[in-house]
């Protein structure tokens, strides 16, 4: 899948914009915005009555090498009770991401773009039911 | 990250770390196309703390369309089909990595931009204090 | 730790108007919500109304809707319930609630008798 190309609504004169070899872009990887410090809420993974793990996946040729993965702990959902109700599902909650993939060809290095799918959390959800004849 | 040369002829003069600036394909690698979340799944309308999905587009930015989620209540939907105001509909936030253009407008230069998107929904049993 | 200060109770002739104030302070940061629950002799204790911080959407249970209205002020941590055309099954204890998503905290409560 390739990058579209800027409309017509923009208008910028070649020469600004740095000159890049066909069928590549070029990417700079300082990232914008990369100190920005989150105030996530505390313990909402395990507080959810869908309360989902962490595993930390480390690919050396993947930036960022780090990708965070949340697996729900259980099929069902905790009710009030404290206890797993399975008349209800927890379900994972997904969202791509972009990452740069560093790729050995013999002695030489190339870089491409690849989109990961990351499971965020989850949620409780009221499964559609049917019921097989 | 750190990488060894597969070849152990080739010149050992590789950075262990990613360069600051790299050339890549204009192709994506991915199976994962990207879809609208309201297609993909009906979790936001199924779920507990269910949520809607807000449409932010940038087209200086790529993707240049993300959906952003927002809790539908403060409290989640019970048994009954009532909010129930003890418990708590909490967005899912998650930092992601998409592309800038830069400088602006520029077709094939871009830089990585780290955002915070709301994917959705989840509910919460608050730990409950009585201030004195 | 967190604190909670509520103003504004009081005794009003049916129809009439009061405006109840929470202000919280100490650790009161990463809020997800700031409301009012009411609590009316021999009966359980029901949610009012609520404001959420990142957007200020507002939510109303139903018996108030029209007549309450819930705002608040980002810089003093404050939230507001602005309270007309109370009538006498108004009467209650108001309690303020901050919710931090994960963590909820219950103010002391303050009075409003709605009589003639």
């Known amino acids: 899948r390739k990058i579209p190309k800027v409309g017509h609504t923009f208008f910028q004169k070649p020469e600004s914009c740095p000159p890049v070899p066909g069928g590549s872009m070029k990417l700079d990887i300082g990232i914008i915005n990369e100190n920005q410090r989150v105030s996530m809420s505390r313990n909402i993974e395990s507080r959810s009555t869908s309360p989902w793990n962490y595993t930390v996946t480390w690919d050396p040729n993947r930036y960022p090498s780090e990708v965070v993965q949340a697996q729900c702990r259980n099929l069902g959902c905790i009710n009030a009770q404290g206890k797993e109700d399975i008349s209800m599902n927890s379900v994972p909650i997904q969202q791509e991401t972009l990452v740069v993939r560093r790729k050995h060809q013999g002695c030489s290095v190339s870089f491409q773009l690849e989109k990961v799918l990351v499971t965020v959390g989850c949620t409780c959800v009221t499964p559609v039911i049917h019921h097989v004849q | 990250g750190i990488t060894i040369p597969r070849n152990p002829g080739c010149p050992n003069s590789e950075d262990k770390n990613f360069p600051r600036t790299v050339m890549v394909n204009l192709n994506i690698h991915n199976r994962n196309t990207n879809t609208n979340p309201k297609r993909s799944s009906d979790y936001y309308n199924r779920s507990t703390s269910p949520w809607n999905l807000h449409r932010n587009e940038d087209p200086e930015r790529y993707p240049s369309v993300i959906w952003e989620a927002k809790c539908r209540h403060l409290g989640c939907i019970n048994a009954d089909g009532n909010v129930d105001y003890h418990m708590n509909s909490v967005p899912i936030q998650q930092e992601i990595l998409v592309l800038r253009r830069e400088p602006p407008h520029c077709p094939n230069s871009f830089r990585l931009e780290k955002i915070l998107v709301s994917v959705g929904c989840t509910c919460v049993t608050p730990i409950v204090h009585h201030v004195a | 730790e967190v604190q909670l200060v509520e103003s504004g109770g009081g005794l009003v002739q049916p129809g009439g108007s009061l405006r109840l104030s929470c202000a919280a302070s100490?650790?009161?940061?990463?809020?997800?919500?700031f409301g009012w629950f009411r609590q009316a002799p021999g009966k359980e204790r029901e949610f009012v109304a609520g404001?959420?911080?990142?957007?200020?959407?507002?939510e109303y249970a139903a018996s108030v809707k029209g007549r309450f209205t819930i705002s608040r002020d980002n810089s003093k941590n404050t939230v507001y319930l602005q309270m007309n055309s109370l009538r006498p099954e108004d009467t209650a204890v108001y309690y303020c609630?901050?919710?931090?998503?994960?963590?909820?905290?219950w103010g002391q409560g303050t009075l409003v008798t709605v009589s003639s």
């Open positions: 404001i959420r911080w990142s957007d200020a959407y507002t």
């Open positions: 609630v901050l919710d931090l998503s994960t963590v909820r905290y």
């Open positions: 100490g650790r009161a940061n990463s809020i997800n919500w």
